[in-house]
């Protein structure tokens, strides 16, 4: 997260880190005791999933292996359309005050809605600085029409934009797959943005979760 702040401890109990060995690979969101939602471009053969801690690499955090993941069938590596994936944990999470599932959206929030995005991604760009603490940024949803003025054909129909006018605050490498939460519901998954990160008036781009609720529910049901 560029130009963000340290999240209030324990305020994001649904936030997970997808690790490749001991290294951060992507963020993710707990949606069920067996399931984590993340970005399709985060796909690996297997994952180590850290839950229940704001500190990356926390020895006291829950760590669960995951060997199965299900990309949206319409995902494109080139355009990042349908950049959403479900990761099935090999064993169920122990729920607690530190580990909770996020609320999936009942509706799509409108432009102007205040939201928070979180992650352990680099806080500087192009030079990288990876924080140990979970970082947050407060952003507002931007209409598709406004966002298309910036990204033109790069922006797909189920992509959601968020940012703050003239501000550098944004997501960056390592934040991918993490949650954009608005009014206590998951509205977005970090997908992409301009590199180097933090270009003013280039919004962060997210997968719009409200458009995928049926796919999420059906995929979890099929593979339970």
């Amino acid at each position: 997260i560029i130009d963000g702040y340290k999240c209030k401890e324990g305020s994001h109990p649904w936030q997970v880190a997808l690790l490749k060995g001991n290294q951060l690979h992507c963020g993710g969101v707990l949606v069920d005791k067996y399931w984590v939602l993340t970005a399709a471009h985060c796909k690996m053969g297997q994952y180590q999933v850290q839950l229940g801690s704001d500190k990356i690499g926390d020895q006291s955090a829950q760590k669960i292996k995951a060997t199965k993941s299900f990309r949206h069938p319409g995902y494109s590596t080139k355009t990042h359309v349908n950049d959403i994936m479900l990761v099935r944990l090999d064993e169920p999470v122990k729920m607690s005050s530190k580990v909770e599932a996020v609320q999936l959206p009942e509706h799509c929030e409108p432009p102007g809605t205040s939201c928070t995005v979180s992650g352990w991604g680099t806080t500087t760009s192009p030079d990288v600085t990876f924080p140990s603490d979970l970082m947050c940024s407060d952003v507002k949803l931007i209409s598709s029409r406004e966002c298309k003025k910036v990204y033109k054909d790069l922006l797909g129909k189920t992509m959601l934009c968020a940012g703050i006018p003239d501000s550098k605050t944004n997501t960056c490498n390592g934040d991918s797959g993490g949650p954009l939460v608005c009014n206590d519901t998951l509205q977005g998954l970090v997908s992409w943005g301009t590199y180097p990160c933090g270009q003013p008036n280039d919004p962060g781009v997210y997968t719009q979760v409200c458009k995928y609720k049926r796919w999420v529910m059906e995929t979890m049901k099929t593979h339970r």
Partner: antibody
């Protein structure tokens, strides 16, 4: 189809400033998610990235050339420019302007100009 | 800066041969690796992006693989029109850096 065209003098005297302009057609220089780059190739040699500029005006330069390079953009003309000061014979090269997809997820040069040979000689 | 070491610097092969070029990065670049083809007197052309993705319109005989520090570029069946110099390029960090190039000739 995006097209890029370099223009500027083909001969520059040592210690002077090399100035090149790239005119972009078929796409807007003010589009987000792209960088506008200068890349050079010494005769018979490999490719060297000089630097890039974004629609915001942010610039990034190769540290090896940073003290001598300035890249600027004129969105009204859909052009961006390169200035390289205090040139020597070692700056003789084919200079390319290029557009790169510049995203957190992937970054690559997808469109190149045809290149223009600049010779530094008195 | 990330150094890119490409090998071989040149090779000669027959039409129909399988050609392999390797590229090694001085540090982990994940899959931020692109391959370009440059014909004499022309600008480079993108063939492969993100280590293994074929650019639209590029023939399927070209392929790429690898992740981290070691990458491979393959032409499955060399054609006369493939005579060119091939460059790898890392896009993990600025400054973007290129390999030294591999000149491919027909025997």
């Amino acid at each position: 189809q995006v097209q890029l065209q370099e223009s500027g003098p083909g001969l520059v005297k040592p210690s002077q400033t090399l100035s090149l302009t790239c005119t972009v057609s078929g796409g807007s220089i003010s589009s987000g998610g792209y960088s506008w780059n200068w890349i050079r190739q010494h005769p018979g040699k490999g490719l060297e990235w000089i630097g890039s500029i974004y629609r915001s005006g942010s610039t990034y330069y190769n540290p090896s050339l940073k003290s001598r390079v300035t890249i600027s953009v004129d969105t009204s003309k859909n052009q961006f420019s390169l200035k390289l000061s205090s040139v020597t014979a070692a700056d003789t090269a084919v200079y390319y302007c290029a557009r790169a997809k510049a995203l957190t997820t992937h970054r690559y040069v997808d469109y190149w100009g045809q290149g223009t040979l600049v010779t530094v000689s008195s | 800066d990330i150094q890119m070491t490409q090998s071989p610097s040149s090779l000669s092969a027959s039409v129909g041969d399988r050609v392999t070029i390797t590229c090694q990065a001085s540090q982990d670049i994940a899959n931020y690796l692109n391959w370009y083809q440059q014909k004499p007197g022309k600008a480079p052309k993108l063939l492969i992006y993100d280590a293994s993705n074929l650019e639209t319109g590029v023939p399927s005989r070209f392929s790429g693989s690898g992740s981290g520090t070691d990458f491979t570029f393959t032409i499955s069946s060399l054609q006369p029109e493939d005579i060119a110099t091939y460059y790898c390029q890392q896009a993990r960090d600025l400054p973007f850096t290129f390999g030294g190039g591999t000149k491919v000739e027909i025997k």
